[in-house]
Amino acid sequence: QAAPFPELCSYTWEAVDTKNNVLYKINICGSVDIVQCGPSSAVCMHDLDTRTYHSVGDSVLRSATRSLLEFNTTVSCDQQGTNHRVQSSIAFLCGKTLGTPEFVTATECVHYFEWRTTAACKKDIFKANKEVPCYVFDEELRKHDLNPLIKLSGAYLVDDSDPDTSLFINVCRDIDTLRDPGSQLRACPPGTAACLVRGHQAFDVGQPRDGLKVVRKDRLVLSYVREEAGKLDFCDGHSPAVTITFVCPSERREGTIPKLTAKSNCRYEIEWITEYACHRDYLESKTCSLSGEQQDVSIDLTPLAQSGGSSYISDGKEYLFYLNVCGETEIQFCNKKQAAVCQVKKSDTSQVKAAGRYHNQTLRYSDGDLTLIYFGGDECSSGFQRMSVINFECNKTAGNDGKGTPVFTGEVDCTYFFTWDTEYACVHHHHHH
């Protein structure tokens, strides 16, 4: 049986059940290389409290559909008096990056995971030439996830003192320049994740090969190498390589630019101080507030919730968007879709789409940007579920009793962007990270 998601096959992936202190290793096409789980384990569970290993999915006992992968085992389990077998179930959804498998829950018999990934899309519009896993768990099983830094088009400019060259990078995947008609970036060779531009020439100095690695609790490393043979004439016989070290800052701060810290014979070392390198619980919340010792900040957007069936309305030219954030109030137009953001076509108000659901909510504060994300909306033709990204700005003089109002700013591939100036986005910092 052919592997259902070939682009996910090259790596062993990790997921964590934080509540029970369990680390899962997943290899969806072969077996994980862990002796204690046996030679054919596709999903290996490591219970760190009891220091035991169990195979909870066998690579030989795999069944697959386009959106679901199940690995059975021969191990019996007792579920409500019936004799079942232990199994793992991975539900796949379309995403814009390779993404990460997320542990959902486990019963006596079934271990459930969800994975938003380009590999599950109906169309190839989000697929990279080359992409590697972009997250890692540290020794305390805390997740560090650089997926939000991945650019689907364009690149980051590396800060370099050399006026004659420009070094462009992407994170964990190659640079897509197709949407840029006239800049230097357009000359970059396909597949490159690190592109050096000198004058009118562009050179591939690195492609992603291995996934993100953790070197210390707050330092992550990504390595790019130039795959193809043939040395560049300005590299003195060496093969180009790029090492990017992502550093979690010691306290809250604005984002910084990736900086070139060393360069020798086409070996480029880049340091990037960014809060995205910090563990995810420091940056994100599933509620509308971020506060407490762990986050170093106090943010509470819950006063923006609307009651009594009213919604914020944002004009999107062809569409009207109805928003009801930080609550579970149904938007009247949205036909009981549990939508936090509802898209209604002006010319045909019967055309209604959920552009993100209120139980699929993430509040993120990273590198000085405060963002509220609603995902899991109605599907687009690509298979991607509509989502909304609301970028908040602090405005102490915002209208509407300080609440302000969301403004639609654009749409890209079924992701809807809004900005929202409000006094409730004014962040209060603590200093003890």
Epitope: Y156, G182, N391, G410, T419
Partner: nanobody, 123 residues
């Protein structure tokens, strides 16, 4: 691609103010940075100011810091440059530009450009 149209240039006395506008159309969210550049006669095009579309993060050339302010109106897909305390050396053609490169002020990293609007500062 993105189309950019500047307006608001003109003749102004030293110490005066002007507000330039740049209307963007097309798939504007494929670009992440919006910049104002200027080119005086016989000189190279130089960076003036930049803003990220998704947030209010801005950067300025040292020569205009404290005098010029870049801003945006997302509802109108428009970028502005408020120019105060204008000096004769600010005389130039001002261009609006868009880039898919983050953290850049280099004009060669901007792939979409407007036609420019002339600002003349003279008594």
């Amino acid at each position: 691609d993105v189309q950019l149209v500047e307006s608001g240039g003109g003749l102004v006395q030293p110490g005066g103010s002007l507000r330039l506008s740049c209307a963007a159309s097309g798939r504007t969210f494929n670009t992440y940075n919006w910049g104002w550049f200027r080119q005086a006669p016989g000189k190279e095009r130089e960076f003036v100011a930049a803003i990220r579309w998704s947030s209010s993060k801005t950067s300025y050339a040292d020569s205009v810091k404290g005098r010029f302010t870049i801003s945006r109106d997302n509802a109108k897909n428009t970028i502005y440059l408020q120019m105060n305390s204008l000096r004769p050396e600010d005389t130039a053609v001002y261009y609006c530009a868009a880039s898919i490169v983050d953290f850049t002020t280099n004009p060669s990293h901007f792939g979409s450009w407007g036609q420019g609007t002339l600002v003349t500062v003279s008594s």
